[in-house]
């Protein structure tokens, strides 16, 4: 019933008043985007806990993978299940819990010297839940299930531009951080200030590509140089 | 399991101080900005202030301005909201949420009552 | 600050029937990455508010079908296909894409 799952899918709502920027008073600024999912809840035991509804397995926790909840069901709606544990049947390594991953359809454990390189140092989430180590933080710990996949995709939450795919960089987003494409030529780009010359922007751009430098676009229109974009241009 | 548990709350008397904390698991918190939101008895909620991934940038509503601090530790997995001159009107149910997808806590409630 | 105004503020709906409520905002909530930043909660005597409804139309996992959103720009509407009994409380709506996170004034749904 509505009831039953309302009771267990807690979210709170939100409204009033805001003060300026920090170092902008009283502007208006856009906050993060984004909708109230449930997290823990007084309401809520082990028992009735909410699925997470989700996309893809990096929207999932380091223990759970993302899957229709029924057999053959509905592939539209999808929520984040319960790692399967060594000697289980998979389809993919993500539906392993961690330490093991997916050998001919079945979960066995990890060997620790398998898998090196870039999948220990990548952190990538989606918009969601997590494989990170508890200080959030990449280390060369045990290896997560969920650290056989892909790096970050555009709109995937990040922690440094390494943890994002190829032609994406990780960049502010409202109040966090999360994989941006990296610019074409002739894209607007900000001229990035140095450190110290603090300046709060809540969407930042991600920098010109590969061979490519953000420079005042050349415009004898623009009056002053203030006033000039930046594009990104050839070297 | 990804979630938010806020704790700190309690009675207190009105020009006091609390700290609330909320600790985070199963993300990646220091990617993450965070807010907290409060709910007074029989009232909407309130958003009470955000705080940057990095902690670098803090926004206050005005009801609370110069008051309250939003901090965080990433190091911890932990976000906080250290009330001073705690005001009757304060007493309310407080929660911490994450923004893009954005998760919320169970809540803890502060009693500002002489 | 974004307002949010909701229409009608209280319903009275026969069980099994649908109900419609509005909602408009002061500006457009379609941010630049393509998404609208609206939402619908309900929440009940003594509860916290329940969410229903994410980005104008995204129903939360297991939210029954008979609840839908619509809209765009600055009009949206949340619709109720057949009320049932346990529907009952205060719908609102709410915008994230400024702060501060703006909603209407709630709408109370009761049963005849």
């Known amino acids: 019933t509505l009831n039953s799952v309302l009771n267990s899918n807690a979210i709170k709502n939100l409204p009033p008043p805001l003060g300026g920027a920090a170092g902008h008073p009283g502007s208006a600024v856009s906050a993060a985007p984004g909708i109230l999912y449930p997290g823990g809840n007084k309401y809520q035991t082990i028992d009735n806990y909410q699925p997470y509804p989700c996309a893809e397995d990096e929207e999932c926790g380091t223990d759970e993978y993302c899957a229709s909840p029924t057999r053959g069901g509905d592939a539209g709606v999808q929520i984040c299940l319960a790692c399967r544990k060594r000697r289980k049947r998979c389809m993919r390594h993500a539906m392993c819990c961690p330490g093991n991953y997916c050998k001919n359809g079945i979960c066995v454990s990890s060997d620790q010297n398998h898998f090196r390189g870039e999948i220990e140092e990548t952190i990538t989430e989606s918009f969601g839940n997590d494989h990170s180590t508890l200080d959030g933080y990449s280390r060369r710990t045990t290896l997560s299930s969920k650290m056989y996949h892909t790096k970050g995709q555009e709109g995937s939450v990040c922690l440094r531009s390494s943890d994002c795919a190829s032609g994406l960089c990780c960049d502010r987003h409202f109040w966090s951080k999360i994989c941006k494409p990296v610019l074409k030529e002739g894209q607007v780009c900000t001229k990035h200030r140095r450190k110290g010359s603090h300046g709060l922007e809540i969407f930042q751009r991600c920098y010109c590509g590969e061979g490519l430098s953000c420079r005042i676009q050349k415009d004898h229109h623009q009056a002053s140089n203030s006033s000039r974009l930046h594009t990104c241009q050839r070297h | 399991q990804v979630q938010l548990v806020e704790s700190g709350g309690g009675v207190v008397q009105p020009g006091r101080s609390l700290r609330l904390s909320c600790a985070a698991s199963g993300f990646t918190f220091s990617s993450y900005g965070m807010h907290w939101v409060r709910q007074a008895p029989g009232k909407g909620l309130e958003w009470v202030a955000v705080?940057?991934?990095?902690?670098?940038?803090?926004y206050y509503a005005d009801s609370v301005k110069g008051r309250f601090t939003i901090s965080r530790d990433n190091s911890k997995n932990t976000l906080y909201l250290q009330m001073n001159s705690l005001r009757t009107e304060d007493t309310a149910e407080y929660y911490c949420?994450?923004?893009?997808?954005?998760?919320w806590g169970q809540g803890t409630l502060v009693t500002v009552s002489s | 600050d974004i307002v949010m105004t909701q229409t009608p503020l209280s319903l009275s709906v026969t069980p099994r029937q649908p109900a419609s409520i509005s909602c408009k905002s002061s500006?457009?909530?379609?941010?630049?990455?393509?998404?609208?930043?609206l939402y619908w909660y309900l929440q009940k005597p003594g509860q916290p508010p329940q969410f229903l409804i994410y980005e104008v139309s995204n129903r939360f996992s297991g939210v029954p079908d008979r609840f839908s959103g619509s809209g765009s720009g600055t009009d949206f509407t949340l619709k109720i296909s057949r009320v049932e009994a346990e529907d009952v409380g205060v719908y609102y709506c709410m915008q994230s894409i400024q702060l501060p996170w703006t909603f209407g004034q709630g709408t109370k749904v009761e049963i005849k």
């Open positions: 949420a994450r923004e893009l997808r954005v998760l």
């Open positions: 500006q457009s909530l379609l941010h630049s990455d393509g998404k609208t930043y």
């Open positions: 705080i940057s991934y990095d902690g670098g940038d803090q």
